[in-house]
Amino acid sequence: GLNDIFEAQKIEWHEGSHHHHHHHHGSGSLVPRGSGSLPRWRQQWSGSGTTSRFPETVLARCVKYTEVHPEMRHVDCQSVWDAFKGAFISKYPCNITEEDYQPLVKLGTQTVPCNKTLLWSRIKDLAHQFTQVQRDMFTLEDMLLGYLADDLTWCGEFNTFEINYQSCPDWRKDCSNNPVSVFWKTVSRRFAETACGVVHVMLNGSRSKIFDKNSTFGSVEVHNLQPEKVQALEAWVIHGGREDSRDLCQDPTIKELESIISKRNIRFFCKNIYRPDKFLQCVKNPEDSSCLSGI
């Protein structure tokens, strides 16, 4: 199984050339580690450490993905893992760049058909439930690279080949150029850049800022949609309350989104999804009589 493969590979992690980033600077404290005669030090970050079984999980997810997506069976999962670990292993985890992830991005190249891209902000679960039913639409996490990294945390250390399972940099408290944040910025940018036709975005109508300029959608994806390829952005504002009949498309933050998009010469549309449960049910069973009325 996969565990055996990794047992056999542990020695191989020391292979290959790794370019190094600048020396430590940042807010992390140092704690001793190792049991040698000389004390060795590990950076102590504010965020949770690398997810347990991280290498095994990435590799397993890659194999699973290629099993159920035959069009991606040309992908060599060992090369994918090598490129993934090469992006952060032995590098200072507050100095990761988008360039570090380019070998991985190249291996994971995938195209989404026009009109089939679904972006989301602060409402991941519903977006994924939707694409699970509407199989011809795709979120970033339905693509190989997003699927590999979804819900995982990872980081390494400068000048060692080890993965840090104790702590990783927190975006706010430590640094923004950490391995996880830079990964999502990189793949989100690429996902938006390659979108075409009418792009959809699911937004959480229960949040104080329905459109948040500081979210990945607001800070990365919106600005990387290509006006020459994208005719329109259609926002679906998802209502939280049962009795919430307000038109959230009139929310000031949605007007702000409309302004940003219009200035980029992309048309903007907005729809209220008053009943997300009914919405999903009607996607599953469009012929249901109750689905002829509004959702």
Epitope: G1, L2, N3, I5, R53, E56, T57, L59, A60, R61, C62, V63, K64, T66, E67, V68, P70, R73, H74, D76, C77, Q78, W81, Q132, D150
Partner: antibody, heavy 123, light 112 residues
Framework: EVQLQQSGPEVGRPGSSVKISCKAS????????MHWVKQSPGQGLEWIGW????????DYAEKFKKKATLTADTSSSTAYIQLSSLTSEDTATYFC????????????????WGQGTLVTVSS | DIVMTQGALPNPVPSGESASITCQSS???????????LNWYLQRPGQSPQLLIY???TRAAGVSDRFSGSGSGTDFTLTISGVEAEDVGVYYC?????????FGSGTKLEIK
């Protein structure tokens, strides 16, 4: 050693539902896709669908989309198939199955099978 | 869906002789990665299917070298050299190039 242990035979009334289980052992349950296959009496094999236990995502053959529901419980390493609105056509043996991984590539063949669960629909 | 068509065997096959089971697919099973996604299974009476061959010609773990797979993109053969009593059962070919994976109708092997 990889093992897929299925629940015992079921008898269901027409129109009712049955749920059968497949308990996995000898490997990490979330690392592999689980497939389900139907074999009608004296007939060949038909693929029903797959579930990714880690995410709960599924896919079904067109003919089973309204008939079968695949679920998984990661805490007990168990996959389930529920068959609804039973008719005599659903009388069959149902297998869970899994691929092997050959040096980080899915083999594309079902290397591990449960022993099968016979579902009989009878009034 | 890809349709898999299996040929019949001249039953029963004399013990110790070779048997060849054929299978045809309605489209090529050769992937751009160079692998041909054709599998062979044996289902012995009262048992679950057992994977014999994957990727058209690679023997599964623990399978006797008396079993070999060959073919092109659409025409495939499973050869059993020196048939033994334990080989009795129904042989299925299966394509796994695309979803849904589809099986042939099966070829029954009986021994004289």
């Amino acid at each position: 050693e990889v093992q897929l242990q299925q629940s015992g035979p079921e008898v269901g009334r027409p129109g009712s539902s049955v749920k059968i289980s497949c308990k996995a052992s000898g490997y990490i349950f979330t690392d592999y896709i689980m497939h389900w296959v139907k074999q009608s009496p004296g007939q060949g094999l038909e693929w029903i669908g797959w579930i990714d236990p880690e995410y709960g995502s599924t896919d079904y053959a067109e003919k089973f989309k309204k008939k079968a529901t695949l679920t998984a419980d990661t805490s007990s390493s168990t996959a389930y198939i529920q068959l609804s609105s039973l008719t005599s056509e659903d009388t069959a043996t149902y297998f869970c199955a899994r691929v092997a991984i050959i040096t980080t590539v899915a083999s594309g063949g079902f290397a591990y099978w449960g022993q099968g669960t016979l579902v009989t629909v009878s009034s | 869906d890809i349709v898999m068509t299996q040929g019949a065997l001249p039953n029963p096959v004399p013990s110790g002789e070779s048997a060849s089971i054929t299978c045809q697919s309605s489209e090529s099973l050769l992937h751009s990665n160079g692998k041909t996604y054709l599998n062979w299974y044996l289902q012995r009476p009262g048992q679950s299917p057992q994977l014999l061959i994957y990727w058209m010609s690679t023997r599964a773990a623990g399978v006797s070298d008396r079993f070999s797979g060959s073919g092109s993109g659409t025409d495939f053969t499973l050869t059993i050299s020196g048939v033994e009593a334990e080989d009795v059962g129904v042989y299925y070919c299966q394509q796994f190039l695309e979803y849904p994976p589809t099986f042939g109708s099966g070829t029954k092997l009986e021994i004289k």
